[in-house]
């Protein structure tokens, strides 16, 4: 009788994670007597996957009827495959003895595991940035196999080109991770913009995974200020408004200064939203001109989103509003605490 051969017909087998892998092995002879064992890897560190003789291998089942001696098929099925199962599997015939001795090994079957990438996670900068600045976004996805993968960046549907991508590790591994950094130039219109990271992989059957970041989390649009004097409401009153325009996010505090002294502080509440996602707000101040002998410098000072304050001033000419003969303000007459500046917002 010819010497036993161990035949592993498949050089490689590719299986999707979660599925079962069938590894084929047949022997050409019934002798010598002794068990078949399956190993992953070769050499002294090889890992026992299945032993016909003994042991508990809950994920492994024999494919054919193993209770008949004439059975020479020692193929196995490994259930619930994960990327960690990737490797070369060897079917090995042992000769019965004390100890059992390796008689002959098959050529090996390389098992590769197709594992889907995790949903891409896009993260932006830790601090907000203003228009015209360039910010970096990162995209990460893990656990995929094989290594080949495609990553694209988009801003509002337009593909970006300024990005760098790495797939790790560089060498052989059971699974891989991708890390990409894209540079995006912010514009004032980006409050409603989205940055999208798109990952395509063989396991996704043409339906790529996407991760998104809203630029509203990243952008800060500083306000423009305009202080205007409205027509007088009464002969001795002037209405001064501070228009705070095109700002984002909404967090804003406004302080009125009269000749450098704080007159009133308020927080933006009833704002109006522009189409581009920025906000407008208006604050007004009613100034009793008759309370002032000299010109008044009114300053609208805005602190937006914790940034250094910006301000706009308006000079109110008192001389332009002559007082009536003998009609001094109550404050001047009585020295009372009655306020001479009134304000509001809208």
């Amino acid at each position: 009788e010819e010497e036993l051969q161990v035949i592993q017909p498949d050089k490689s087998v590719s299986v999707a994670a979660g599925e079962s892998a069938i590894l084929h092995c047949t022997v050409t002879s019934l002798i010598p007597v002794g068990p078949i064992q399956w190993f992953r890897g070769a050499g002294p560190a090889r890992e026992l996957i299945y032993n016909q003789k003994e042991g508990h291998f809950p994920r492994v089942t024999t494919v054919s009827e193993s209770t008949k001696r004439e059975n020479m098929d020692f193929s196995i099925s490994i259930s619930n495959i994960t990327p960690a199962d990737a490797g070369t599997y060897y079917c090995v015939k042992f000769r019965k003895g004390s100890p059992d001795t390796e008689f002959k090994s098959g050529a090996g079957t390389e098992l590769s595991v197709r594992a889907k990438p995790s949903a891409p996670v896009v993260s932006g900068p830790a601090a907000r940035a203003t228009p015209q600045h360039t910010v970096s976004f990162t995209c990460e996805s893990h656990g995929f196999s094989p290594r080949d993968i495609t990553l694209k960046w988009f801003k509002n549907g337009n593909e970006l080109s300024d990005f760098q991508t790495n797939v790790d590790p560089v060498g052989e591994s059971v699974s891989y991770s991708i890390h990409s950094t894209a540079k995006v130039v912010l514009t004032r219109e980006d409050v409603h913009s989205q940055v999208i990271c798109e990952v395509a992989h063989v396991t996704l059957q043409g339906d790529p995974l996407r991760g998104t970041a809203n630029l509203s989390e990243t952008i800060r649009v500083p306000p423009t200020l305009e202080v205007t004097q409205q027509p007088v409401r009464a002969e001795n009153q002037v209405n001064v408004t501070c228009q705070v325009r095109k700002f984002y996010p909404q967090r804003l505090q406004l302080t009125w200064l009269e000749n450098g002294n704080v007159s009133r502080t308020e927080t933006a509440s009833t704002v109006t939203e522009n189409k581009d996602g920025t906000y407008n707000w208006m604050s007004w101040l009613l100034v009793n001109v008759s309370a002032h002998r000299d010109d008044v410098k009114l300053t609208c000072q805005v602190e937006h989103d914790g940034q250094p304050a910006v301000s706009k001033s308006h000079d109110l000419k008192v001389s332009a509003h002559p007082k009536e003969q003998g009609s001094n303000t109550a404050a001047e007459n009585t020295g009372s605490n009655e306020r001479n500046i009134y304000g509001g917002s809208g």
């Epitope: 068990p35 003789k53 001696r69 003895g97 004390s98």
Partner: antibody
Framework: EVQLVESGGGLVQPGGSLRLSCAAS????????MHWVRQAPGKGLEWVSA???????YYTGSVKGRFTISRENAKNSLYLQMNSLRASDTAVYYC????????????WGQGTMVTVSS | DIQMTQSPSSLSASVGDRVTITCRAS??????AAWFQQKPGKAPKSLIY???SLHSGVPSKFSGSGSGTDFTLTISSLQPEDFATYYC?????????FGQGTKLEIK
């Protein structure tokens, strides 16, 4: 059903011969290592002989040169030719099938009695 | 030849008892040890192979253990039908050899 049935036992004089047969059913005998085991009256079990799937044969020391194990695939049968019989060969002879991969005994026949006496 | 020494040669026990029979090989036999049960006038019945694997149809009250030279057969809860003679065997190399047997009797 997997079964082994021995036959051919009986009374024989010392120096005489006997041929035991074992008919197998429910499996292909040639695919298994097959054995003969005996048990002298009131004694324990003693392995006697074996034949491998390649026709290789093995014997316990006390029967070497006197007993011959063989099989006939067409009849799915195992045989033990016993020559130069001695009183010490008196025993029940069992035909036994070796296991699928390790030759562990799994199926036993009911046995046939061989008595060597003058 | 490899000798198989079984102990005890006889054992008295009661129904419900847990009993253990041991077998020692004169040299290492890996785990190629088998156990058989034989009742008077009957052919032996295969119980255990490769030291701890149960043959098909053998109740789980029978268990085996060991490797190398020392092996045990344990019957967890004796029933009347378990009173018989038990043999160990090595089948790592020819000539295959049996222990002398342990006769398990009702106390």
């Amino acid at each position: 059903e997997v079964q082994l049935v021995e036959s051919g036992g009986g009374l024989v004089q010392p120096g005489g011969s006997l041929r035991l047969s074992c008919a197998a059913s429910g499996f292909t005998l040639s695919s298994y290592d097959m054995h003969w085991v005996r048990q002298a009256p009131g004694k324990g079990l003693e392995w006697v002989s074996a034949i491998g799937t390649a026709g290789d044969t093995y014997y316990t020391g006390s029967v070497k040169g006197r007993f011959t194990i063989s099989r006939e695939n067409a009849k799915n049968s195992l045989y033990l030719q016993m020559n130069s019989l001695r009183a010490s060969d008196t025993a029940v002879y069992y035909c036994v099938r070796g296991g699928v991969w390790d030759d562990a005994f799994d199926i036993w026949g009911q046995g046939t009695m061989v008595t060597v006496s003058s | 030849d490899i000798q198989m020494t079984q102990s005890p040669s006889s054992l008295s026990a009661s129904v419900g008892d847990r009993v253990t029979i041991t077998c020692r090989a004169s040299q290492g036999i890996n785990n190629y040890a088998a156990w058989f049960q034989q009742k008077p006038g009957k052919a032996p019945k295969s119980l255990i192979y490769t030291a701890s694997s149960l043959h098909s149809g053998v109740p789980s009250k029978f268990s085996g253990s060991g490797s190398g030279t020392d092996f045990t057969l344990t019957i967890s809860s004796l029933q009347p039908e378990d009173f018989a003679t038990y043999y160990c065997q090595q089948y790592v190399s020819y000539p295959y050899t049996f222990g002398q047997g342990t006769k398990l009797e009702i106390k």
